[in-house]
Amino acid sequence: PTGAVEVQVPEDPVVALVGTDATLRCSFSPEPGFSLAQLNLIWQLTDTKQLVHSFTEGRDQGSAYANRTALFPDLLAQGNASLRLQRVRVADEGSFTCFVSIRDFGSAAVSLQVA
């Protein structure tokens, strides 16, 4: 490892109404010369480590979470690893971890509250 990837998420929980869409913000600082082929991005449920969404080998691997999640592909190269969760349900409430690996890795958890 050359130096940990710093991953930033909001400190405060994201609050969403049932049925609306929520954005779980996550960002990292890409180094000069960074390309998406180097990126491994994994969103997981923090406690269970269940896979939610991933981007590896230069492409979006899609949602593993009831097909209700999406990344912002046009913003990934700038370090925006945020996740869109569609049609929020009460059962979605909890902590989501954004795991970013380039050459080294880092991770951070963001909480979702459903109102």
Epitope: Q50, L51, S54, F105
Partner: antibody
Amino acid sequence: QVQLQESGPGLVKPSGTLSLTCAVSGGSISTSNYWNWVRQSPGKGLEWIGEIYPTGNTNYSPSLKSRVTISIDKSKNQFSLKLNSVTAADTAVYYCARGYNWFDPWGQGTLVTVSS
Amino acid sequence: EIVLTQSPGTLSLSPGERATLSCRTSQSINAILLAWYQQKPGQAPRLLIYGASSRATGIPDRFSGSGSGTDFTLSISRLEPEDFAVYYCQQYGSSPRTFGQGTKVEIK
């Protein structure tokens, strides 16, 4: 380059408490990473014990949860393991390691023997 | 918890030969949620492969990983003297994270 180093007593009495510390060098323990304890015994192989995030949030292995406490000291750039009510079955090499998913890097490991 | 079963327990090969190590998971996992480690006597495990097929920093290209679902493979194309060691797989798709029991690659 982040390096990890475990320290603590190599011998603990049955029913006592195992206490180990992992010193992090070459980087800050406050970075966005999880810090783990893993042990290795001849009987059970490699076994994840638990993890801590710089915020203090912890997750523990269900099989050890009732006996384990992991804490972090950001001012000393270190984190610690306490395992109470130990028995001979807790004799193992204990490693600290970094990572939420895979583990990298690892400390060199320290052998802890539970014996009277 | 997910149980990982590695086979064979021991693999006896000569330098220059190809090694194929198997790891089976008790539940299907996404391929990006599996890692491989190498451990030599008296040393800590060393990360080789993550995401089933991505080599960690500094790992030679003779090491490769593949697989999906419940069946995963670590291949070493041409064994070098320093490759004789114990290899472990690990899953991180379910908590607690768990390891296989290891495959020892020994000199024939």
